[in-house]
């Protein structure tokens, strides 16, 4: 079956700068700023656009080894990034895949809001438990905070 879920996280970084760093340059930046979570991101095929496959290797101490993602759409104008987790122990034995739409919007008082809409595709009649969703949200938040800290410390970058 399918389970729809969404979450949002505020950031002090403006939308354009956050998208440029966290999304467009995330493959390089995230392993650099959060090596305790992700050790490497490798583009297996494609140039970063739709159809690109990324192999993400987690750091030691993280309960997952790797994840394989497929890029479905990159919308630079609207700060939107669509991708699907298609493989990896992160899916466990109950999930077939998970599609995410990450959208960064300007926040009214400055900064931005990172919105993630997810579609969990479970195998057969399996239910998607709340822990799985909470875990995904916490992981994304941890990476976002690491990027945020880096950007606050390196004000000349990604402008």
């Amino acid at each position: 079956g399918v389970f729809n879920y969404e979450a949002e996280t505020p950031s002090v970084i403006p939308a354009a700068r956050l998208f440029k760093s966290y999304v467009l340059d995330g493959d390089k930046l995230i392993p650099k700023v959060a090596p305790q979570v992700i050790s490497s991101v490798e583009n297996v095929g494609g140039n970063g656009g739709p159809g690109t496959i990324k192999n993400i290797t987690f750091a030691e101490g993280i309960p997952f080894k790797f994840v394989k993602e497929r890029v479905d759409e990159v919308d630079n104008a609207n700060f939107k990034y669509n991708y699907t987790v298609i493989e990896g122990d992160v899916l466990g034995d109950k999930l077939e895949k998970v599609s995410h739409e990450l959208k960064i919007v300007a926040a009214p008082g400055g900064g931005s809001i990172v919105k993630i809409s997810s579609k969990f595709h479970a195998k057969g009649y399996h239910e998607v438990n709340a822990e799985k969703m909470k875990g995904a949200k916490e992981m994304a938040e941890k990476l976002l905070r690491a990027v945020e800290s880096y950007l606050l410390a390196h004000t000349a970058e990604y402008n």
């Epitope: 399918v2 389970f3 969404e6 599609s99 809409s117």
Partner: antibody
Framework: QVQLVESGGGVVQPGRSLRLSCAAS????????IHWVRQAPGKGLEWVAV????????YYGDSVKGRFTISRDNSKTMVYLHMNSLRTEDTAVYYC???????????????WGQGTLVTVSS | EIVLTQSPGTLPLSPGERATLSCRAS???????LAWYQQKPDQAPRLLIY???SRATGIPDRFSGSESGTDFTLTISRLEPEDFAVYYC?????????FGQGTKVEIK
């Protein structure tokens, strides 16, 4: 403007097959999931099936699983519902409906066709 | 599956009156993933509300949606003659996507 036009309904005997078509226009078809929803005479709405924007994912309601197959042709902006082993309880108006959210979809329906009536009777 | 129970089954009201329609879910609807549709005789349903409270394009502001826990409400502030119809709620949090059995708003 968004338009969905169903066709292919009619009277069919139990156990036989039928193929419904849904012709879409007025939106970027290849970016939206499409659903089939049916309504038995005098009854409420029942979700039947969905096909993802790229045709990779297909899901069905329990009452039609294993008998109905949904497919799409993005080049023709068409969606089809192949109905096999039809039963009298499949008698209904069948609507195709556009998902309200692009790409992965959110599974609510912002535009509906006018419906096509399928009558399963001996 | 998530079961949606609508009440009342029939709501007899006069034009100008306020209509309050209820939809109760058998389990939690995360992210307010609930929609409302209007259906008139021999017509297709029409989306009114999604996300429990967001009005769809072109829907007049006399239609509003709200939620409290697993209880969802569609309110029509002042009934117009064209509002007499059947109303359905639908959840889209987990498949199979399910509808309530409908509430008929009829002229008293």
């Amino acid at each position: 403007q968004v338009q969905l036009v169903e066709s292919g309904g009619g009277v069919v005997q139990p156990g036989r097959s039928l193929r419904l078509s849904c012709a879409a226009s007025g939106f970027t078809f290849s970016r939206y999931a499409i659903h089939w929803v049916r309504q038995a005479p005098g009854k409420g709405l029942e979700w039947v099936a969905v096909i993802s924007y790229d045709g990779d994912d297909k899901y069905y309601g329990d009452s039609v699983k294993g008998r109905f197959t949904i497919s799409r042709d993005n080049s023709k902006t068409m969606v089809y519902l192949h109905m096999n082993s039809l039963r009298t309880e499949d008698t209904a108006v069948y609507y195709c409906a556009k998902d309200g959210y692009s790409l992965y979809g959110k599974d609510y329906f912002d535009y509906w066709g006018q419906g096509t009536l399928v009558t399963v009777s001996s | 599956e998530i079961v949606l129970t609508q009440s009342p089954g029939t709501l007899p009201l006069s034009p100008g009156e306020r209509a309050t329609l209820s939809c109760r879910a058998s389990q939690s609807i995360t992210n307010s993933y609930l929609a409302w549709y209007q259906q008139k005789p021999d017509q297709a349903p029409r989306l009114l509300i999604y996300g429990a409270s967001s009005r769809a394009t072109g829907i007049p502001d006399r239609f509003s949606g709200s939620e409290s826990g697993t209880d969802f409400t569609l309110t029509i502030s002042r009934l117009e003659p064209e509002d007499f119809a059947v109303y359905y709620c639908q959840q889209y949090v987990r498949s199979p996507w399910t509808f309530g059995q409908g509430t008929k708003v009829e002229i008293k």
